[in-house]
């Protein structure tokens, strides 16, 4: 997260880190005791999933292996359309005050809605600085029409934009797959943005979760 702040401890109990060995690979969101939602471009053969801690690499955090993941069938590596994936944990999470599932959206929030995005991604760009603490940024949803003025054909129909006018605050490498939460519901998954990160008036781009609720529910049901 560029130009963000340290999240209030324990305020994001649904936030997970997808690790490749001991290294951060992507963020993710707990949606069920067996399931984590993340970005399709985060796909690996297997994952180590850290839950229940704001500190990356926390020895006291829950760590669960995951060997199965299900990309949206319409995902494109080139355009990042349908950049959403479900990761099935090999064993169920122990729920607690530190580990909770996020609320999936009942509706799509409108432009102007205040939201928070979180992650352990680099806080500087192009030079990288990876924080140990979970970082947050407060952003507002931007209409598709406004966002298309910036990204033109790069922006797909189920992509959601968020940012703050003239501000550098944004997501960056390592934040991918993490949650954009608005009014206590998951509205977005970090997908992409301009590199180097933090270009003013280039919004962060997210997968719009409200458009995928049926796919999420059906995929979890099929593979339970």
């Amino acid at each position: 997260i560029i130009d963000g702040y340290k999240c209030k401890e324990g305020s994001h109990p649904w936030q997970v880190a997808l690790l490749k060995g001991n290294q951060l690979h992507c963020g993710g969101v707990l949606v069920d005791k067996y399931w984590v939602l993340t970005a399709a471009h985060c796909k690996m053969g297997q994952y180590q999933v850290q839950l229940g801690s704001d500190k990356i690499g926390d020895q006291s955090a829950q760590k669960i292996k995951a060997t199965k993941s299900f990309r949206h069938p319409g995902y494109s590596t080139k355009t990042h359309v349908n950049d959403i994936m479900l990761v099935r944990l090999d064993e169920p999470v122990k729920m607690s005050s530190k580990v909770e599932a996020v609320q999936l959206p009942e509706h799509c929030e409108p432009p102007g809605t205040s939201c928070t995005v979180s992650g352990w991604g680099t806080t500087t760009s192009p030079d990288v600085t990876f924080p140990s603490d979970l970082m947050c940024s407060d952003v507002k949803l931007i209409s598709s029409r406004e966002c298309k003025k910036v990204y033109k054909d790069l922006l797909g129909k189920t992509m959601l934009c968020a940012g703050i006018p003239d501000s550098k605050t944004n997501t960056c490498n390592g934040d991918s797959g993490g949650p954009l939460v608005c009014n206590d519901t998951l509205q977005g998954l970090v997908s992409w943005g301009t590199y180097p990160c933090g270009q003013p008036n280039d919004p962060g781009v997210y997968t719009q979760v409200c458009k995928y609720k049926r796919w999420v529910m059906e995929t979890m049901k099929t593979h339970r």
Epitope: H41, D127, K152, L154, T171, W192, P196, Q199
Partner: antibody, heavy 122, light 107 residues
Amino acid sequence: QVQLQESGPGLVKPSQTLSLTCTVSGGSISSGGYSWNWIRQHPGKGLEWIGSIYRSGSTYYNPSLKSRVTISVDTSKNQFSLKLSSVTAADTAVYYCARAKALTTHRYVDYWGQGTLVTVSS
Amino acid sequence: DIQMTQSPSSLSASVGDRVTITCQASQDIANYLNWYQQKPGKAPKLLIYDASNLETGVPSRFSGSGSGTDFTFTISSLQPEDIATYYCQQARDLPFTFGGGTKVEIK
């Protein structure tokens, strides 16, 4: 189809400033998610990235050339420019302007100009 | 800066041969690796992006693989029109850096 065209003098005297302009057609220089780059190739040699500029005006330069390079953009003309000061014979090269997809997820040069040979000689 | 070491610097092969070029990065670049083809007197052309993705319109005989520090570029069946110099390029960090190039000739 995006097209890029370099223009500027083909001969520059040592210690002077090399100035090149790239005119972009078929796409807007003010589009987000792209960088506008200068890349050079010494005769018979490999490719060297000089630097890039974004629609915001942010610039990034190769540290090896940073003290001598300035890249600027004129969105009204859909052009961006390169200035390289205090040139020597070692700056003789084919200079390319290029557009790169510049995203957190992937970054690559997808469109190149045809290149223009600049010779530094008195 | 990330150094890119490409090998071989040149090779000669027959039409129909399988050609392999390797590229090694001085540090982990994940899959931020692109391959370009440059014909004499022309600008480079993108063939492969993100280590293994074929650019639209590029023939399927070209392929790429690898992740981290070691990458491979393959032409499955060399054609006369493939005579060119091939460059790898890392896009993990600025400054973007290129390999030294591999000149491919027909025997």
